[in-house]
């Protein structure tokens, strides 16, 4: 149906109801104007990574799915004028960083949400005239610093905040006439703003109060912008901010209840009516509850998030819900309740956390829940509960703690006493260990039976801080805060290392690459990692991300050939770095950047021939540097090190030269500066890129061909990882 010419596809005026399939991937201009398209789906423009101009005006588009423009990385101009858009999806332009012209005029848009243009930072021309806009959320235009043309005329705007426009230095055309501007104290700023820009915002007039109706805003004196006494004192002249409210597509909203049960949602809907008292979000696929997800809904009394996939809850996910009576979170994947999660939920009567994977409770988790009547923690992974966890629950009548793997040691004695005094646990919670108490009801065991073995169980001792979270991993041994996984033929770090771990022993295993799994982000107490006696050849960038408390790493006896600073990213507190007995041949000038806390660095027994100038310059705390047992080539490239070793008061054990022959076994710092020479072809600097190819040769992967080149000496810069070297047909008199 469409016509294609070069990179232009023309489908205009064809009465199309949907965007046609199979638009060529190389399309740069697409004309779909003058059709009957009603909806833009997130797959309609998928893959059109070269599209620059998209014409969608004069259709009947009422819905644009979020992500519809995500692939349009090159999009520069988009025309959506003369459609039926009412709701403006947030984050619609997240992928269109090059968009500079956007026409949304002549639609029925009622509000501009705060994140409307997030991602489209290059917009220069934005047309929003002839809509029904009554609300522009604060910050909606904040990212649009390059805006030159903004048309908001012929809308229903009554109020605007100064924050919306005071960051547009390039604005040259601005139209705001034909709105319903109410010229009270909240709009006083606009008069000044327009006077400072006499060429923009022409004919902008007040529509109220009645005595200012028809007056040009720029001509009204500041003292005439007044509010009633009650309003004047309100929030120090803050304009009541509007917010964009709607019932999410697929949900039903009535009587202040938003019902989104079983709608396949993957995230919490935003911008719901602020008066809602109940949200039903059960049986969806929500994974994350972000910060302040429900904070606008001050009247919320019941929130049901059961049977989702929730594994991550922001600490302030439920902030501000002072009227909340019921919070239903059962049937999710919650492993931990962040600190302060339930802070301020003073009205909560029911808290259902059953059927999750909660492995610990902070001692203050429930401190504000004075009116809680029922707490269900049934079917979780709790091994212990710290004394005092339930002390704030003054109104508690029913508690479900069964189906948890409780360790009934001395740290759980208090719970038995508590349940004897308050027989509120109605689900029949039982011990899992020790074996002598296994399967017995906690509330029926005599308290003297709750004992600890000689070495107190750290897992339960630290439970109030949520370090009692995980059992000892299979193949490891856990004693105190040491987790010993040595000699187990491991080639990767076990999952579920306990959070309380301070020392992690992974030595004498089969590691070859230390992968960036993010494991250390979950180990806030970690101080020492032993990775000695493995087969590590590489450490991925970010492997130690999150290990900010680690102060000792042992990488002795591995197979590292080079060291780069990216390997050690995240080790801000590292004091000891042992790299003994590896295969390091060169130390670059940025090998150790970012390790400003390191005091002891051992490079003993490697194959280091050279060290780039300044290699240790960023190690501000260095006091011991072991460079012994390395075959240093004391040529001109190493002169700086002799000088540095003399100047620095660092214990080094006097590393010695191995080359050239006349300096063999001489301590580097004893070599006179003029003796560091690159004579007789000795200018090897093995820190030069390993992959370079001698100019006389050709290199393919690790094969180097230098045949028939009339060579008398070995060419310089042969890659160190060479596997095949062809030197036939040359003029060598000696074997090089």
């Amino acid at each position: 149906q469409c016509s294609c010419s070069g990179s232009t596809v023309d489908c205009h005026g064809l009465a199309l109801r949907i965007v046609p399939r199979n638009i060529p991937r190389n399309t740069e201009r697409l004309d779909l104007n003058g059709n009957n398209i009603t909806r833009i789906t997130k797959t309609d423009f998928a893959g059109l990574r070269h599209l620059r101009i998209l014409q969608l005006m004069e259709n009947k588009i009422s819905t644009i799915e979020r992500g519809a423009f995500h692939d349009l990385k090159e999009l520069e101009r988009l025309r959506l004028n003369r459609n039926n858009l009412q709701l403006f999806p947030e984050l619609l332009f997240l992928g269109t960083a090059k968009l500079y012209r956007l026409d949304l005029s002549e639609n029925q848009i009622q509000a501009i949400p705060r994140k409307a243009f997030r991602g489209a930072v290059d917009i220069k021309n934005l047309q929003l005239d002839y809509n029904q806009i009554s609300c522009i959320e604060d910050g909606a235009f904040r990212a649009l610093r390059d805006l030159e043309v903004l048309t908001l005329n012929n809308n229903n705007i009554t109020r605007l905040s100064v924050a919306s426009f005071n960051h547009m230095p390039k604005l040259r055309t601005f139209r705001l006439h034909s709105n319903n501007l109410y010229c009270d104290c909240h709009l006083a700023w606009l008069s000044d703003w327009l006077r400072q820009r006499p060429r923009v915002g022409l004919y902008t007039q007040c529509m109220g109060p009645s005595h200012l109706r028809g007056h040009n805003v720029a001509e009204v004196q500041k003292r005439e912008f007044v509010c009633s006494d009650e309003e004047e004192g309100h929030q120090s002249f803050m304009a009541p901010s509007c917010s964009v409210l709607h019932c999410p597509i697929a949900c039903t909203c009535s009587n202040n209840i938003v019902d989104c049960r079983g709608k396949g949602l993957t995230e919490i809907p935003t911008n719901l009516p602020e008066t809602i008292t109940e949200i039903r979000l059960e049986q969806n696929s929500i994974r994350v509850i972000p910060p302040g997800a429900f904070s606008p809904y001050k009247k919320l009394r019941r929130l049901d998030l059961s049977n989702n996939q929730i594994s991550e809850l922001a600490p302030d996910a439920f902030q501000g819900l002072r009227s909340l009576n019921s919070l239903v979170l059962y049937g999710n994947k919650i492993t931990e309740l962040p600190k302060s999660l339930f802070e301020g939920l003073f009205s909560l009567q029911l808290l259902l956390l059953n059927a999750n994977k909660i492995n610990c409770l902070r001692v203050d988790a429930f401190q504000d829940l004075h009116n809680l009547n029922l707490l269900s923690l049934y079917d979780n992974k709790l091994q212990t509960v710290a004394k005092g966890t339930f002390s704030a629950l003054r109104a508690i009548q029913t508690m479900h703690l069964a189906q948890n793997p409780f360790i009934c040691d001395c740290h759980l004695k208090w719970l038995a006493d508590y349940l004897h005094t308050n027989p509120i646990e109605t689900s029949g919670a039982r011990c899992t260990s020790p074996r002598r108490l296994a399967n017995k009801r906690i509330g029926q065991i005599k308290s003297k039976k709750f004992r600890c073995s000689g070495t107190e169980d750290y897992r339960s001792k630290l439970s109030g801080d949520c370090f009692a979270d995980l059992a000892c991993p299979e193949k490891c041994r856990c004693e105190g805060t040491t987790v010993d996984c040595s000699n187990q033929k491991l080639n990767k770090i076990p999952d579920h290392i306990p959070q309380y771990t301070a020392e992690l022993r992974l030595n004498n295993n089969e590691f070859t690459v230390l992968e960036a799994t993010g494991i250390f982000k979950k180990l806030p107490q970690l101080r020492k990692i032993n990775l000695s006696n493995n087969k590590i050849t590489d450490i991925e960038e970010g492997a130690f991300e999150g290990a900010s408390g680690v102060n000792e790493i042992l990488l002795t006896s591995n197979r590292l050939e080079n060291v780069q600073h990216k390997m050690f990213k995240g080790l801000e507190s590292l004091k000891t770095l042992m790299l003994r007995s590896n295969r390091i041949s060169c130390v670059g000038n940025d090998s150790f950047t970012g390790l400003g806390s390191v005091r002891l660095l051992s490079l003993y027994d490697n194959q280091i021939t050279t060290v780039a100038p300044g290699a240790f310059g960023t190690l501000h705390s260095l006091s011991t540097l072991n460079l012994l047992a390395n075959p240093f080539n004391c040529n001109c490239h190493l002169a700086w090190l002799g000088e540095w070793l003399r100047r620095k008061r660092i214990v080094t054990g006097n590393p010695r030269c191995q080359k050239p022959y006349f300096l063999k076994e001489i301590p580097i710092q004893d070599v006179a500066i003029q003796d560091f020479t690159c004579d007789d072809g000795n200018d090897d600097n093995s820190c030069s890129p390993l992959s370079r190819c001698p100019s006389e040769c050709t290199c393919l992967d690790t094969v180097v061909r230098c045949s028939n080149k009339g060579l008398k000496v070995l060419p310089k810069g042969i890659p160190r990882d060479v596997t095949e070297l062809y030197l036939d047909g040359n003029q060598f008199t000696l074997v090089p």
Partner: antibody, heavy 118, light 107 residues
């Protein structure tokens, strides 16, 4: 929103028991609290007890402990109130009610009149 | 149990009148007080929760106030459909308890 539909009026002999049902329509109430409140003729309202269907365990007012049993059938979204050892002073309208917390009653059934008379 | 006392037990008023009903708790219940309206032969209807919050669909002429032990329900301008019995109820502690009711009749 949830609508609560109760079973019909009952006339019972003293000493017998009565079982009143309350069915939810317009949405499951498996994780809601469902309470029973009674009102004797010309009298005020009196809370008897409540249940959360997914747990099955009920919570009773001291006054009714031992004589009232509240149960739930999740599969049919129905809650039952069983009152035994009936006396003439148990003649009342029995309401089921549900709400956002244990003790707030947003929605009410239409009521079931139980008359105890020989 | 917490006792709830309503006053007056009945009152007569005309259409358009401002009507005030009070409710007193035998101990501090913070703001955990609800108001219900009941018409003859009907189930109670939820009006106000947490002392001052209007339930959805309830006309704005109804308002509630108070905290601690003393609470008030006010009807700013009585309408024909407002003639009924009004109950307060505390939701602070078990068992929840109701006031004895206030009957609002036509004068």
């Amino acid at each position: 929103q949830v609508q609560l539909v109760q079973s019909g009026a009952e006339v019972k002999q003293p000493g017998s028991s009565v079982k009143v049902s309350c069915k939810a329509s317009g949405g499951s109430f498996r994780s809601y609290t469902v309470s029973w409140v009674r009102q004797a003729p010309g009298q005020g309202l009196e809370w008897m007890g409540g249940i959360i269907p997914i747990f099955g365990t009920a919570n009773y007012a001291q006054k009714f402990q031992g004589r009232v049993t509240i149960t739930a059938d999740e599969s049919t979204d129905t809650v039952y109130m069983d009152l035994s050892s009936l006396k003439s002073e148990n003649t009342a309208v029995y309401y089921c009610a549900t709400g956002s917390g244990w003790y707030t009653f947003d929605y009410w059934g239409q009521g079931t009149l139980v008359t105890v008379s020989s | 149990d917490i006792q709830m006392t309503q006053s007056p037990s009945s009152l007569s008023a005309s259409i358009g009148d401002r009507v005030t009903i009070t409710c007193r708790a035998s101990q501090n219940i913070n703001s955990y007080l609800n108001w219900y309206q009941q018409k003859p032969g009907k189930a109670p209807k939820f009006l106000i929760y947490a002392a001052s919050n209007l339930q959805s669909g309830v006309p704005s002429r109804f308002s509630g106030s108070g905290s601690g032990t003393d609470f008030t329900l006010t009807i700013s301008s009585l309408q024909p459909e407002d003639f009924a019995i009004y109950y307060c109820q505390q939701s602070y502690r078990s068992p929840p308890t109701f006031g004895g009711g206030t009957t609002v009749e036509i004068k």
